[in-house]
Every structure is written in C-alpha cells, then in structure tokens.
C-alpha cells in the first residue's frame, strides 16, 4: 500500500536553506495530515443505485504515508463487493462503480506512517431517486457535556426527497413519569422547520441550566416515512465555591 506523493500537495518549500536536505541527510519526519480537509466535509453521500462513488482523503507526511480503507470498521477487500473497487493512491481516493444497496455503510480511510495515523469516515447510503424516507448522517446529533450557563449547539444532517419536516424534541417528565398513558414518551417540541425556523438542522440552547440536561431528539419526516436520532446533554456545575445562584423554571409539555 505504499504511496507516491500526493498530486494535491503543494510544491512550495518554506524551509530555510540550512534545513534543506542534502544527499546524505534524511528529511524531517512529519506525521500524516490532511492536505485538503475542506474537500472532506461532506460525510453523508446518498447515491442512486448504479452510480459511481468516489471518496477522497488527500494527505501528506514524511515519509510518504500509506493508505488503506475499512468498511464498517473492518478490512475492506476488493472481493467484498461485486465489481471490486479501485484505490487511486496518487489522489488518495477509492472508487466504487455501479453501487448497489449492499454497498451501504461507513467507509474509513486510514493514512499512516511510522510517526502517526489519521482517519476519516464517510457514510454511504444507496437510495432510490424516487421519493424516499429521510436519511440522517450517523453520529449526529452528538452527545455534549457543558458547564452551567454555556451555550450548546446540536446539529442534525438530513438528506431527504421530498422536502422534510424537521423537529427538535426533548424527553421530559410529567408528574414524575416519562411515559404517558398512551405508552409514548412525554416530549417537548423545542423547534420545528417552518416559516420562522431558519436552519432547522441546528438546535441552539443558550445559557443552559441543569434542568436542560437530558435526551434531545432530531426527528425528521416526510410523507414516505421518518427517521430520528438522539443525543444527551449533560450540564455540569462548577465547584462549590464557584457555584452561582441560578433560578430554574420548570419545562412544560406543549
């Protein structure tokens, strides 16, 4: 899996003349690093069947790092899928042609040399082009632990055709019970997509109190179906001598 130099690398050399390597000196070791992290920001790829998927992890390091790929955390071999796949070492990419539903999963690039290792995971979903249920990026929203009085941002990345309805909910207790008479959990609607909701995929909580600890749910629906993922917020109090007096008001189910 040895790699040639990345064609994404810059040729600029900022080192001084004294630092430049001569025939008998070794270059300074550099642990692997991403050369174009902005090209890796799109983690969820929802792709119609039969299309080609290209995941890239442009990197550099000294000595040249190696590149390998995992699927769902396990070694990914070409014979694991019909038609195999291509790894383009010069562009730090993996290409899978003619995707099928069994290609769904998480694909992780691992870039390493003797001085370090970095990795990045892409999520692939193979979808019908016709209307389908919403798809949520794995790992979002993410659990948060913050200090009392902080601001918190939960994010939910959604792929949906048709237009989805996004709700942010919080699990609450009513009269000491988390479950209602209909056997469904009590929830409070904090935010939903609509005329007055800009950026419905983000929930921001300001100046959080201990009462706001708990489970937050991103619920996305369209007329085909729905999907939801949740995260936990833990609000920690400062040490006793630093503890401010905070008045908390109860939350009520809407």
């Amino acid at each position: 899996d040895a790699l040639p130099s990345s064609e994404d690398d810059d040729d600029d050399d900022d080192s001084s003349s004294e630092e430049k390597e001569t025939d008998n000196t070794k270059p300074n070791p550099v642990a692997p690093y991403w050369t174009s992290p902005e090209k890796m920001e799109k983690k969820l790829h929802a792709v119609p069947a039969a299309k080609t998927v290209k995941f890239k992890c442009p990197s550099s390091g000294t000595p040249n790092p190696t590149l390998r790929w995992l699927k769902n955390g396990k070694e990914f071999k070409p014979d694991h899928r019909i038609g195999g796949y291509k790894v383009r070492y010069a562009t730090w990419s993996i290409i899978m042609d003619s995707v099928v539903p069994s290609d769904k999963g998480n694909y992780t690039c691992i870039v390493e040399n003797e001085y370090g290792s970095i990795n990045h995971t892409y999520q692939l979903d193979v979808v019908e082009r016709s209307p389908h249920r919403p798809i949520l990026q794995a790992g979002l929203p993410a659990n948060k632990t913050v200090a009392l009085g902080s601001n918190v941002e939960f994010m939910c990345k959604v792929y949906s055709d048709p237009q989805p309805h996004i709700q942010w909910l919080k699990h609450i207790e009513v009269n000491g019970s988390k479950i209602g008479p209909d056997n469904l959990p009590y929830v409070q609607i904090l935010k939903h997509s609509g005329i007055n909701s800009s950026d419905a995929e983000v929930l921001t909580l300001f100046n959080v109190t201990e009462a706001q600890s708990g489970e937050y749910v991103c619920k996305v629906s369209n007329y085909i179906g729905e999907a939801n993922q949740s995260a936990w917020l833990t609000v920690t109090r400062p040490a006793l001598e630093e503890r401010p007096a905070v008045m908390t008001s109860p939350l009520y189910l809407e």
């Epitope: 790829h45 291509k86 003619s98």
Partner: antibody
Framework: QVQLQESGPGLVKPSGTLSLTCAVS?????????WSWVRQPPGKGLEWIGE???????SYNPSLKSRVTISVDKSKNQFSLKLSSVTAADTAVYYC?????????WGQGTLVTVSS | SYVLTQPPSVSVAPGQTARITCGGN??????VHWYQQKPGQAPVLVVY???DRPSGIPERFSGSNSGNTATLTISRVEAGDEADYYC???????????FGGGTKLTVLG
Amino acid sequence: QVQLQESGPGLVKPSGTLSLTCAVSGGSISSNNWWSWVRQPPGKGLEWIGEIYHSGSTSYNPSLKSRVTISVDKSKNQFSLKLSSVTAADTAVYYCARATDWFDLWGQGTLVTVSS
Amino acid sequence: SYVLTQPPSVSVAPGQTARITCGGNNIGSESVHWYQQKPGQAPVLVVYDDSDRPSGIPERFSGSNSGNTATLTISRVEAGDEADYYCQVWDSTSDHRVFGGGTKLTVLG
C-alpha cells in the same frame, strides 16, 4: 451483446409531442443501469435529457423537466421518451443510451425535425 | 447547475500529444468520463472514472483529474483521432448528468 435501437416519427409539428421508443435487445432492462436519452442539435454539443431505472425512478435535465416524461416497459424490454410543446429548437438527433456513471452503450441515433 | 468548460478547439500535428481540458468546480471530487464522436456517428466512450480505458480503446488515450481540471491526453496523435471530444460527469450534488460543450480536435497536415 446488448444493442439499443431508437424508433419514432422523424417529423413533429410545433407545439406537438415528440415520442420515441428505445428497444433493448440482447440483455435485460432490469439490470443495474440507467436508461437515458441524450440529444444533439445539428452542429451543436450533447445534451442530457433524462433517464429512468427499471424500478421507475427518473431524473430529468432541469431545463427540460417540465416537458419531459420517460417511462419503462419491462415486459417489452424498452423505454420511451415524450417531449411536449416542441419548437424548432428541439430539432436534434436523439440517442438512447445505457448508463451507470457513464454512458457505455449508445443507439445509432434518430433525427427528429420539428417543422410545420 | 454544474458547468463543465472545454476549449472549443485543439489542433495538433500527427505524432504529437493532444491535451483536452475540462474545467469544473472541484471536479477532482467527481468521476469524469470522456467520449469521442466522429461526424454522423454516435459517441464512443474512450475514458471513464478519470483515467480508465474501456476494452478496445488504444493506450494512447489517457486521463487525469485533480482540483478544478480534468484532462484527456492523446499521445502519438493519428489522423483517425480527428473528432469531437466531450467530458461528462454525474453531478452528485444536483443528481444530474452534465456534458462539457465539446472540443473539436483537428489533426494538422
């Protein structure tokens, strides 16, 4: 080997509907491919019109979407194009093609002229 | 929508190397495919997935793709290579296919 053959009228009147069919022989239309239509006005470049998967999923060029319908008939192993409200600007050679990410197989093309 | 930009024409002497470019925003993240079309004929795929050749296509045809430019390279150009060449991608953002405007390759002499 798989072959594609376009058929349909070579002359359509303005404001009428252009209708073409592509027969797939030597293979199944239910394979993991998209079945596409591409056109080329005289002396100009290629323009993707749209495509269909055997399940019925479709995708259309946004500039033509309001006028285009592509359908598939699995029992006859063929797919069809309908383009409504045509004008002289729709005069072109129309190709049907098989695609994954790329077009690996093309019909020979059929010239459709829009004229009264 | 996604736009692919090609030079309208490229001229090259026989035996030389022709390079046809296809520009697009961050096109290196997409898979680029190239077609050759001769007058009165349907297009023929000559390169797919940036740099792969279908069977039957001479090794003289090669491709590369990085940054904002993909390139089709034809080495040791022959008179029979004279044709129009089109790049194409499936734009994963809009879920549409896009062709470049085409480049007419003229073999001099």
